[in-house]
């Protein structure tokens, strides 16, 4: 690596993947193994994140970017950059501090994470129940009873591909 020649900060010419080494007359040195610098002009390289235990490596660390982790099966990511792994529950359950617990009657959870939520009260939005709720599914609301003329058939719409529930970043 060449000695930098900038008249201002000699470190500003050090590219990502290197650091400005004060111990070597501000020469741009490559980041040591298991470290990285994602921007130029850095005076140190950052230690690579290690994906251990319940975390598994989604993307290996390189000299210019940190490792990315996700979670082993049975767990899902929480927080920015998958800072935590949280236990999955089954649909129809919620995770409490005492573990997975079945949703009470009148509530549902269609995800492996999150809370049991009350079924939508269709009448509050001026609609009627087309499909009853279960522990795993919310009710499906349809037109208000007045909107259904005699002989009109009410068709159950297809379930959405994915309900809110947050996939790893």
């Amino acid at each position: 690596f060449e000695r930098t020649r900038s008249l201002q900060d000699p470190c500003s010419n050090c590219p990502a993947g290197t650091f400005c080494d004060n111990n070597r007359n501000q020469i741009c040195s490559p980041c040591p193994p298991n470290s990285f610098s994602s921007a130029g002009g850095q005076r140190t390289c950052d230690i690579c994140r290690q994906c251990k235990g319940v975390f598994r490596t989604r993307k290996e660390c390189s000299s210019t970017s940190n490792a990315e982790c996700d979670c082993t099966p049975g767990f899902h990511c929480l927080g920015a950059g998958c800072s935590m792994c949280e236990q999955d529950c089954k649909q129809g359950q919620e995770l409490t501090k005492k573990g997975c617990k079945d949703c009470c009657f009148g509530t549902f959870n269609d995800q492996k994470r999150g809370i049991c939520r009350p079924w939508t009260n269709c009448s509050l939005d001026g609609k009627s129940v087309l499909v009853n709720g279960t522990k795993e599914r919310d009710v499906v609301c349809g037109p208000s009873p007045a909107d259904l003329s005699p002989g009109a058939s009410s068709v159950t719409p297809p379930a959405p591909a994915r309900e809110p529930g947050h996939s790893p970043q």
């Epitope: 809370i115 009260n121 919310d138 609301c141 959405p160 994915r162 809110p164 947050h166």
Partner: antibody, heavy 120, light 106 residues
């Protein structure tokens, strides 16, 4: 980056209705429940309800049932909160807030707020 | 319905530690989240799931929760920490906020 941008301030007469919008950007709108929270001048935060942007399913705080309607337009990544039969006590800043990922339901991003003034 | 009780105000000198409490029946069994709100601004999540910090929130902010009390602790308090702080839980069918605590930095 993640943003929730709300519609501008409104002045309404008692008995009227108001509809506040909240446009989301920087994330998948259908992936996170959207909540509405209000704050009267000098008072604390008061939860009003949520909507599931995918299905349109809603849940409202008991206090507002019958007066509030939360809807969404998925094509515009926008949630709406309509409050009817307004009274002076409804003068408040209304916030939309995205539900986060934590156990037990947190609100991780908030709109800038919309001031609704109810005055005759 | 579930209620959360916070002290209306807490005062602390710069550099010291501020503790803001949030009381609720068996709150330790629930997940508690904390928000900071500065005048004229929207709330900001500072602690979630009792003690976890969102990215960008300084390590000086920490939380704990057991029994009937959850606590937000701000160490090495700075003038910029002056704000209202709200605790929040989910209780079976509604989101519940505490009444808020005004933190004054002396």
């Amino acid at each position: 980056q993640m943003q929730l941008v709300q519609s501008g301030a409104e002045v309404k007469k008692p008995g009227a209705s108001v509809k506040v919008s909240c446009k989301a950007s920087g994330y998948r709108f259908g992936g996170y429940y959207m909540h509405w929270v209000r704050q009267a001048p000098g008072q604390g935060l008061e939860w009003m309800g949520w909507i599931n942007p995918n299905s349109g399913g809603t849940n409202y705080a008991q206090k507002f049932q019958g007066r509030v309607t939360i809807t969404r337009d998925t094509s515009a990544s926008t949630a709406y909160m309509e409050l009817s039969s307004l009274r002076s006590e409804d003068t408040a800043v209304y916030y939309c807030a995205r539900e986060g990922e934590a156990v037990g339901l947190d609100l991780d991003y908030w709109g800038q707020g919309t001031l609704v003034t109810v005055s005759s | 319905s579930y209620e959360l009780t916070q002290p209306p105000s807490v005062s602390v000198a710069p550099g010291k530690t501020a503790r803001i409490t949030c009381g609720g029946n068996n709150i330790g069994s629930k997940s508690v989240h904390w928000y900071q709100q500065k005048p004229g601004q929207a709330p900001v999540l500072v602690i979630y799931y009792d003690s976890d910090r969102p990215s960008g929130i300084p390590e000086r902010f920490s939380g704990s929760n057991s029994g009937n009390t959850a606590t937000l602790t701000i160490s090495r308090v700075e003038a910029g920490d002056e704000a209202d702080y709200y605790c929040q839980v989910w209780d079976s069918s509604s989101v519940v906020f505490g009444g808020g605590t005004q933190l004054t930095v002396l």
